[in-house]
């Protein structure tokens, strides 16, 4: 069962698996949630002990029964991991802790104007896990305004001390705020030299990459495939680092694959969730249970529902045996990965899907698109919403995109003349406008947040957020789209689609069925040539065919320009403006969402 509350002055007795230092009980709970085995924890605050070395300790615990005896202890705070919960889990911690110094290896010292600048520096430094910033009031003159970047083997502090006039906090890489490059390529027949910080068993290079991504010290990896000549090293995933942050040497090695951690783009790619099945493969580990079930999917479901299960192997039933039920072996290990991987055994193996909720919902695979045709099918664009106004009569006003369970991203120009959010209705999971009747459920708008630099669509900043009155429950037909990652600045998107119920030609009417059009992106230089009377800024992005014919039009405004990259859809643009519709050499101009990621996160996470 999911228990989110914290228990003050309570200590959970026994079950210790590890002790780390965290600045708060809340952060201890997050660390516990991300630890492969932790189900419960006890945090010791500064008042709980006479001994300052015991302050801020976070004891991670496990229990076969998922519970431990409770003992009264002043200053202790205990709680449960969020593994048992169905809600989204994030490692993002934006909190700044005053008068605390988180200890680690201090590897960089520089002057910064503010704690925020120091945190940004940490976020944009490949090695940095957390930082301490000495304020202007710090007693030592030479240390005032000093920003210390720190790292540790575990990513958590080696100790936390009280220290007046300093502030401390964590890197925001896990909040998708890093400007570091995001290298998604996996290099075949390549091994990286450099030091190994850890090694685990993985069934393929993509699982290896995911493990590297959420390992605090891993910057890149080398994976030895099943065909690797040295049997003892097959399926071995080597987690690596270097001082420069890049591999020093690339060695040509047949049957090895190498790549990089996706820590700077982890919000827009699944890094915890290993959803594939591995046929003719056995995962070895500590056995938790053996259950007779029908099929490997049922086995995975069983593993996902068993909170301590990390991975499984399903042994299919022998013909006509046991009503077609095979044996489902639920397993776990100290690090969440199999201790050994055996091939050619006839088993089907995989991982729990419990960790999928640690990834952004937007990374979930959606139904394959129907290629060709202009009308969409249900569930094809599950982030697309239709925004209606009820004044003077109800009608479709603009498109928009779900980016969070209470947030719609749209265009600022949609709200010209809109005096109050009360007249707005957001319909989600809609394919045909004709579905919208008087009794159709909708989401009310609590707040309209328009970018404060917005004046008119053509001059940019054409972006707005709608905060919904209630939260959206995600389903196959209504789920969020990923924001582009700041680390993806150099990605060239080749699979982009514009969607909406807008006009199909300049003088037309709102369409009943959601329309879609595949449109190529156009460089800003090229776009500027087509719009000599306007300034096409880097905060805009253009798309369209030279010959015209396909474009967004009136009524599509605020809707998404969605681009698929590495199997994940990203909200690259917001339909903003253009000269006419689908005119020759007049591309559509969209708000470049990448340039507003900070603004979006600032407003939605305030």
């Amino acid at each position: 069962e999911c228990v989110t509350r914290l228990f003050k002055d309570i200590h959970f007795e026994g079950g210790d698996i590890a002790t780390v230092f965290t600045p708060s009980a809340k952060h201890c709970q997050v660390v516990c949630t991300h630890h492969p085995r932790c189900l419960l924890f006890t945090f010791t605050g500064e008042s709980a002990s006479e001994d300052p070395t015991q302050w801020f300790t976070c004891v991670l615990k496990d229990s076969v029964t998922e519970t431990l005896p409770r003992v009264n202890r002043t200053g202790a705070i205990s709680g449960y991991s969020f593994k048992q919960c169905s809600h989204q889990i994030s490692a993002c911690n934006k909190d700044i802790y005053v008068d605390l110094n988180m200890k680690g290896i201090n590897y960089n010292s520089s002057l910064a104007e503010s704690a925020q600048e120091c945190q940004e520096r940490c976020t944009d430094d490949v090695h940095c896990h957390f930082f301490t910033y000495a304020t202007r009031q710090f007693p030592s003159l030479e240390h005032r305004n000093i920003c210390l970047l720190k790292h540790t083997q575990t990513g958590t502090p080696t100790g936390i001390m009280k220290l007046d006039k300093v502030v401390t906090g964590f890197s925001l890489k896990s909040c998708a705020l890093s400007n570091l490059a995001c290298i998604r390529d996996v290099f075949p027949n390549t091994a990286f030299a450099d030091s190994n910080i850890d090694s685990v068993m993985a069934p393929d290079a993509f699982v290896c990459r995911r493990i590297c991504t959420h390992h605090p010290g891993c910057l890149f990896f080398t994976f030895f495939s099943q065909e690797w000549p040295k049997e003892s090293q097959r399926n071995l995933c080597l987690l690596k680092t270097s001082e420069s942050g890049l591999p020093s040497t690339r060695i040509k090695k047949s049957k090895a694959l190498s790549g990089f951690s996706l820590q700077s783009c982890r919000h827009s790619i699944p890094v915890f969730c290993h959803s594939s099945f591995y046929h003719d493969t056995d995962f070895l580990g500590e056995e938790l249970d053996i259950v007779a079930v029908k099929g490997h999917e049922a086995c995975q479901k069983l593993c996902t529902n068993a909170v301590r299960c990390q991975f499984f192997t399903y042994a299919p039933a022998q013909a006509s045996c046991n009503e077609g039920k095979g044996k489902c072996y639920l397993k776990l290990s100290s690090n969440g990965s199999p201790t050994k991987i055996l091939r050619g055994t006839g088993g089907i193996s995989g991982y729990t899907l419990r960790l999928c909720k640690m990834d952004n919902e937007c990374t979930t695979k959606i139904k394959p698109r129907i290629v060709g045709g202009t009308a969409s099918v249900r569930g094809e664009w599950p982030w697309q919403v239709t925004l209606h106004t009820t004044s003077p009569t109800q009608r479709h006003l603009c498109g928009g995109s779900i980016i969070g369970n209470q947030w719609i991203l749209t265009a600022a120009h949609c709200f010209y003349g809109v005096e109050s959010p009360k007249i707005l209705r957001v319909y989600i999971g809609i394919l045909n406008q004709s579905e919208i009747k008087e009794d159709t459920s909708f989401f009310g708008v609590q707040e309209i947040i328009i970018h404060d630099q917005y004046k008119m669509a053509e001059s940019g900043y054409d972006i707005a957020l709608l905060k919904l009155e209630t939260t959206v429950n995600y389903t196959d037909s209504q789920r969020p789209i990923c924001l582009p990652s700041k680390g993806d600045r150099n990605v060239i998107y080749t699979d982009c689609w514009v969607t909406g119920w807008g006009y199909r030609k300049l003088r037309d009417k709102i369409q009943n069925t959601l329309q879609k059009a595949k449109i190529p992106l156009v460089t800003n230089d090229e776009c500027q040539k087509r719009y000599r009377g306007h300034k096409i800024t880097h905060k805009m992005i253009c798309a369209g065919y030279r010959e015209g014919g396909k474009d967004a039009c009136k009524g599509d405004s605020g809707g998404p320009l969605s681009c698929k990259h590495n199997e994940v859809w990203h909200l690259v643009g917001i339909t903003s403006w253009g000269e006419g519709c689908a005119q020759r050499e007049r591309p559509g101009v969209y708000t470049n969402v990448l340039e507003y990621v900070d603004w979006i996160l600032e407003k939605t996470q305030a």
């Epitope: 590897y107 002057l111 301490t132 710090f138 007693p139 030592s140 240390h143 000093i146 210390l148």
Partner: antibody, heavy 124, light 107 residues
């Protein structure tokens, strides 16, 4: 052994410039700040400025602003102090001195290691 | 800038006796004060930092006290090698400033 070794004595004409070097050894050069202090004959100590060898940031005493430049070369663990538009009152012994350890936060410190000093004589 | 004033300018003391040197700041420097010893023809040597903490290798006969604007360096029993000039220095604000020095000479 931690030490700071400075360049040799200099004799300069008024209006000229002088560049004094200070080579550090026995510790991590970029982890400590470096100060420059001078002492005119028979006078007390006068602080001139500071450099952070890691990023190269500097802070100078108002009196020397516009005339002094402090630089560093991390490859040779050397800091330099250049004083331009020399006048006779710049005749002094110039010292480099190691300041705070910048990779740890602590409240109090002093200049714990000093160079042997470089005598600069300004005379026409 | 913060002006540091040392007194007396010269202190005549016999070996084995106690010497007390004063340093006054024109405004509070908290405990951000260091003391240095300088012998003729040599570079200064750090004795005390943080107003009262002895630097590495400094004998226990040297002690520092005070905070805010009034500071004292005490040499409990003067040895022959202690006859030198002593400077105080504030580390509380830019520019760093030194006192004019106190010369401790043999009586």
């Amino acid at each position: 052994e931690v030490q700071l070794v400075q360049s040799g004595a200099e004799v300069k004409k008024p209006g000229a410039s002088v560049k004094v070097s200070c080579k550090a050894s026995g510790y991590t050069f970029t982890s400590y700040s470096m100060h420059w202090v001078r002492q005119a004959p028979g006078q007390g100590l006068e602080w001139m400025g500071i450099i952070n060898p890691s990023g190269g940031s500097t802070s100078y005493a108002q009196k020397f602003q516009g005339r002094v430049t402090m630089t560093r070369d991390t490859s040779t663990s050397t800091v330099y102090m250049e004083l331009s538009s020399l006048r006779s009152e710049d005749t002094a012994v110039y010292y480099c001195a190691r300041g705070a350890y910048l990779l740890e936060l602590y409240y109090y410190y002093g200049m714990d290691v000093w160079g042997q000093g470089t005598t600069v004589t300004v005379s026409s | 800038e913060i002006v540091m004033t040392q007194s007396p300018a010269t202190l005549s003391v016999s070996p084995g006796e106690r010497a007390t040197l004063s340093c006054r700041a024109s405004q509070s420097v908290s405990s951000n004060l260091a003391w240095y010893q300088q012998k003729p023809g040599q570079a200064p040597r750090l004795l005390i930092y943080g107003a009262s903490t002895r630097a590495t290798g400094i004998p226990a006969r040297f002690s520092g006290s005070g905070s805010g604007t009034e500071f004292t360096l005490t040499i409990s029993s003067l040895q022959s090698e202690d006859f030198a000039v002593y400077y105080c220095q504030q580390f509380n604000d830019w520019p760093l400033t030194f006192g004019g020095g106190t010369k401790v000479e043999i009586k």
